[in-house]
């Protein structure tokens, strides 16, 4: 996160850290807890690393430096990448992770509500992006979970800023015209959440951007509302019933 500040314990209890353990262990992506046994993240996090057993998922944590060999983590039972995601495109950058064992909810570890299917009418004015990603383009992973308040921008405006890319209605963009605040490398897969009528909803999944926090280059996020059918289909067919945190 560029231009952010430290988060507090329990402030973003749905935020998880997706880490890979090969010779060393490192944080690669964020994710959002959406049910006892489900995490929503970006498909591109698994490019070149599709093996389930190399991944460790840490939930209910604030500081990555607090993680030791004794810190409990979740393992992956199944990675479900959107069937239309292609490594040659930026579309459908969404994936579900089914955990091997369900998580208990606590003050520091609980799910984010999902938006309504095809939610286009809600005007979100209080949106935040969180993650342990770089604090500048040529930066490094941060220890303490960072947060930043970023306004949504229209897809029309976003397309003007990204003429060389196709911004679809299944994407949502957020950023300041002057730059300075944005997601960055290592924040991929993490949440863009917006508070509406007193409730936090998962509006976007951190996907891509041209650099980080550059002027007139907003961040681009996978629009969760556009994938509600897919999320429900995959979680129900795997579980027999949905265990999602739907909006009240």
């Amino acid at each position: 996160i560029v231009g952010g500040t430290n988060s507090s314990w329990g402030e973003w209890p749905w935020q998880v850290s997706l880490q890979v353990k090969l010779t060393a262990q490192r944080h690669l992506c964020g994710g959002s807890l959406i049910g006892h046994q489900w995490v929503l993240t970006a498909a591109h996090c698994f490019d070149g690393l599709p093996l389930q057993d190399v991944w460790r998922i840490y939930s209910g944590i604030l500081n990555l430096s607090d993680i030791t060999k004794d810190t409990p983590f979740s393992q992956i039972k199944e990675i479900i990448i959107h069937q239309n995601y292609k490594v040659s495109e930026g579309n459908h950058d969404i994936a579900l992770i089914k955990l091997q064992a369900p998580l208990n909810y606590t003050e520091f570890q609980k799910p984010i509500c999902l938006p309504s299917k095809g939610d286009t009418s809600t005007i979100y004015t209080n949106c935040w992006v969180t993650g342990w990603g770089f604090s500048k383009e040529k930066g490094e992973i941060q220890n303490i979970l960072q947060k930043v308040n970023i306004p949504l921008v229209t897809n029309e405006e976003c397309q003007k800023r990204y003429q060389d890319y196709k911004i679809t209605q299944r994407m949502v963009c957020a950023g300041y015209k002057e730059g300075g605040k944005d997601a960055c490398k290592g924040d991929s897969g993490g949440p863009l959440v917006c508070k509406h009528n007193g409730m936090w909803r998962l509006v976007g999944i951190t996907s891509w951007g041209e650099g980080c926090a550059r002027r007139e280059q907003p961040g681009v996020y996978t629009k969760v509302a556009e994938y509600m059918d897919w999320i429900l289909e995959k979680t129900q067919s795997s579980d027999g019933k949905a265990q999602m945190q739907s909006p009240a």
Partner: antibody, heavy 125, light 108 residues
């Protein structure tokens, strides 16, 4: 299956014009950046131009700027290269290519993942 | 413009040998925008590596790419008969996009 098929090459005199076409199939053409690359006989590859998915943004190599125009018709899934004021040094095989733009580490990647078979343009008197 | 300098110009190797091709750039190139292509005589180029290190679809794992900043390498761990040809590095980090002059890999 992704396919790109160039046409329109041939022999033309210096100062003449030619329009190359590239018919695309097997993918959503309107979502992709497209590019032209050329290769003079026995030489290496030289990037010529690219065009954004909507067609609203174009960039050219200095060697062709002001003489070549790239365009596209998304309704026909076709890419074009209008070549005017041709010179002997424009003699080359011209390839159209699809520009893939994936995502890696919250940035985009850019690479030419599919190429046509090429069409030969010969500029000679 | 970003100049791409490939070395060596020609590499003479026997099947089964390891090939190491170098690509140096005149300015910093974001790894996401560095690709390698293979071209055999009379054929269009074929994408091998993108993002400096990711193998394109269908490319065997004997091909690998590494590098960062201004220094990139393509390695073919064990040459197969079909690997002989010319290899190009290419950057799309900044316009104009540019290719290296190529490295020819020939049978020894």
């Amino acid at each position: 299956e992704v396919q790109l098929l160039e046409s329109g090459g041939g022999l033309v005199q210096p100062g003449g014009s030619l329009r190359l076409s590239c018919a695309a199939s097997g993918f959503t053409f309107s979502h992709y950046l497209m590019t032209w690359v050329r290769q003079a006989p026995g030489k290496g590859l030289e990037w010529v131009s690219y065009i954004s998915p909507s067609g609203g943004h174009t960039i050219y190599a200095d060697s062709v700027k002001g003489r070549f125009t790239i365009s596209r018709d998304n309704s026909k899934n076709t890419l074009y290269l209008q070549m005017n004021s041709l010179r002997a040094e424009d003699t080359a095989v011209y390839y159209c290519a699809r520009v893939a733009q994936g995502i890696a580490a919250r940035s985009r990647t850019t690479q030419f993942d599919y190429w046509g078979q090429g069409t030969l343009v010969t500029v000679s008197s | 413009d970003i100049q791409m300098t490939q070395s060596p110009g020609t590499l003479s190797l026997s099947p089964g040998e390891r090939a190491t091709l170098s690509c140096r750039t005149s300015q910093f190139v974001n790894s996401n925008y560095l690709a390698w292509y293979q071209q055999t005589p009379g054929q269009a180029p074929r994408l091998l590596i993108y993002g400096a290190s990711s193998r394109a679809t269908g490319i065997p794992d004997r091909f690998s790419g590494t590098g960062y900043g201004t220094d990139f390498t393509l390695t073919i761990s064990r040459l197969e008969p079909e690997d002989y040809g010319t290899y190009y590095c290419q950057q799309s980090s900044r316009t104009p996009w540019t290719f290296g002059q190529g490295t020819r890999v020939e049978i020894k």
